[in-house]
């Protein structure tokens, strides 16, 4: 384990012509903050992919208001380091993304408005425990100067923070199988530290941070017993989740749950809800005390000191049931946006997005017009996952590639003749009719049935109808 540290030295206009406009103004003062995202290896991943090594957000910088007429200076920065703790080994090679964000401090409804000002990315090799490395990155007309390093947190040492050292218990030698810790000869290598919570009885590790299970146990922390109960008249191939399939047309037929447990069907098989005092896949394990660890998902066991007294599981938030075995319905909070369908998978929430939307919470409205060109001066109009072109006069079709015939719809009334024109169409009216579309009859006495004159025009004034 250790910490990646990032120190921002300056953020301001880069060298060369075309200095950027100040991100803040007298009308809209703002302040900066930074976000760093780290990924292991030299991957060229998208900015949106998870920051597998970790991420951090800086404090907000001082409020900045532009001085009119002055060139954009280096902008005031937040105090302190950005620190990204890493729990496992430092990979040695890593990719970084550093984003500069602007927080506008106007009177926005619903809190301050954030916008991304600049994003820089890079791939570097770095040994833990080494000196600060300096770097300059440019994003458009902006320049970011920063330093970074990785350091191990005791008792970890080494270029990858994988060797663990502790002070010697005896002055002369280290314990059995443990070597001195070079260059700290007065310290000894310590035994491996498995993943936090890994069962000391049923789990072990060969690398720091892992948890491998002994036979008969499963789960991320090796705390879940693998069911050994036999299958009755198996109906099909054995299931990886339960070890067997239940006979009959439905998984709950004949109630496979023992000791008064109630059965409910799941997409793959069935699930037993056990009465207090029993647990296991089919509620087959009884005489349970708190020493048996009957409370799942971090539940706290109270009472049940001997097999005859009942225990009670106090469940952590997010879990319920007599053994804290059930999750609360988190989808009722409707976290998915834009009409996405929420799925609670247990380990995570997932959103199934409607067409035209994407992202973990369907928060991204897909740019339907991206890469779609409308020909002949047409403009692209987005809408619900599809795009259409609004074509310039004289063109039609999906992409405005077809030359439209403005006369095709026979727009001239009362037998008028239509002529296509570069600016649209012109109607030559039959005798006795007038108007842009020959829609008005001319009365025999010379008066026309024109609409009433708009306000400000006297009936005798000339009017244009196009």
């Amino acid at each position: 384990a250790g910490v990646f540290e990032l120190q921002i030295h300056s953020f301001g206009p880069g060298p060369g012509p075309g200095a950027p406009r100040s991100p803040c103004s007298a009308r809209l003062p703002c302040r900066l903050f930074f976000r760093v995202c780290l990924k292991p290896g030299l991957s060229e991943e998208a900015a949106e992919s998870p920051c597998a090594l970790g991420a951090a957000l800086s404090a907000r910088g001082p409020v900045y208001t532009e001085q009119p007429g002055a060139p954009a200076p280096d902008l005031p920065l937040p105090d302190g380091l950005l620190q990204v703790p890493f729990r496992d080994a430092w990979p040695g090679t890593f990719s970084f993304i550093i984003e500069t964000w602007r927080e506008e401090l106007g009177d926005q409804i619903g809190g301050p408005a954030w916008s991304l000002l600049a994003r820089v990315a890079g791939r570097r090799r770095l040994a833990a425990g080494g000196p600060w490395a300096r770097d300059i990155q440019r994003a458009g007309a902006w320049e970011l100067r920063f330093s970074y390093r990785a350091r191990c947190e005791p008792p970890a040492v080494g270029t990858a923070c994988t060797r663990l050292c502790r002070p010697r218990s005896a002055p002369s030698r280290c314990g059995p199988g443990l070597r001195p810790c070079a260059p700290l000869e007065d310290e000894c290598e310590a035994p491996l530290v498995c993943r936090a919570g890994c069962s000391p009885e049923h789990g072990f590790c060969e690398q720091p941070g892992e948890c491998r299970c002994l036979e008969g146990w499963t789960g991320p922390l090796c705390t879940v017993p693998v069911s050994t109960s036999s299958c009755l008249s198996p109906r099909g191939p054995s299931s990886a989740t339960t070890g067997c399939l239940v006979p009959g047309p439905g998984p709950c037929d004949g109630n496979p749950c023992a000791n008064g447990g109630s059965c409910s069907e799941t997409p793959r098989s069935f699930e037993c809800t056990c009465p207090r005092g029993f647990y296991g896949l089919r509620c087959e394990v009884s005489g349970v005390t708190c020493a048996d660890g009957p409370c799942f998902n971090g539940g706290l066991c109270v009472g049940g000191a001997d097999p005859d007294s009942a225990y009670i599981c106090h469940c952590p938030p997010g879990f319920q049931g007599s053994n804290c075995e059930k999750r609360v319905d988190r989808c009722s909070l409707q976290p998915c946006r834009n009409g996405g369908l929420c799925l609670d998978l247990g380990h995570a929430l997932r959103c199934r997005c409607r067409a035209g939307f994407a992202g973990p919470r369907c928060e991204h409205d897909l740019d339907d017009c991206a890469g779609r060109a409308c020909a002949n001066g047409g403009t692209c109009v987005e809408g619900g996952g599809a795009h259409r072109c609004s074509c310039a006069l004289g063109f039609g079709g999906r992409d405005c590639r077809e030359r439209a015939d403005p006369c095709a719809a026979r727009p001239c009334a009362h037998g008028g003749r239509c002529y296509a024109h570069f600016s649209g169409l012109v109607c030559a009216c039959a005798p006795g009719y007038m108007g842009a579309r020959c829609e008005f009859p001319v009365h025999p006495d010379g008066a026309s049935a024109l609409p009433a004159a708009p306000p400000g025009l006297r009936p005798g004034d000339p009017q244009r109808y196009l």
């Epitope: 976000r35 998870p50 991420a55 951090a56 988190r330 409707q334 976290p335 946006r337 919470r361 928060e363």
Partner: nanobody, 120 residues
């Protein structure tokens, strides 16, 4: 890591009022959805009121017109104003939040809960 800290629970008489608050802190980039659940003894946990991912408010039928949820975005805090309280509102009230973390992942978090007791 993200923490949700609830406060404002307590004992009140029927018809009385309480205001719960829940403050989120930690590695938060943005809060997508946030609200209040409750769990009465021997009952399933249920949503009381919340701000959904789309920003709209949602209330359980049993509290409509009596409870009001509000928020202070700058403080990453939600409030539940409970009035005309009834005995059946007695429960542990949990704050819940669907949070976008600094690493762009989304995670769902729960507070530790605050007890609301309504009795004459």
């Amino acid at each position: 890591e993200v923490q949700l800290v609830e406060s404002g629970g307590g004992e009140v008489q029927p018809g009385g009022s309480l205001r719960l608050s829940c403050a989120a802190s930690g590695s938060i980039f943005s809060i997508n959805a946030m609200g209040w659940y409750r769990q009465a003894p021997g009952k399933q946990r249920e949503l009381v009121a919340g701000f959904t991912g789309d920003g709209s408010t949602k209330y359980a039928e049993s509290v409509k017109g009596r409870f009001t949820i509000s928020r202070d975005n700058a403080k990453n805090t939600v409030y539940l104003q409970m009035s005309s309280l009834r005995a059946e509102d007695t429960a542990v009230y949990y704050c819940a939040a669907d949070v976008q973390l600094l690493n762009s992942d989304y995670e769902f978090y729960w507070g530790q809960g605050t007890l609301v007791t309504v009795k004459p």
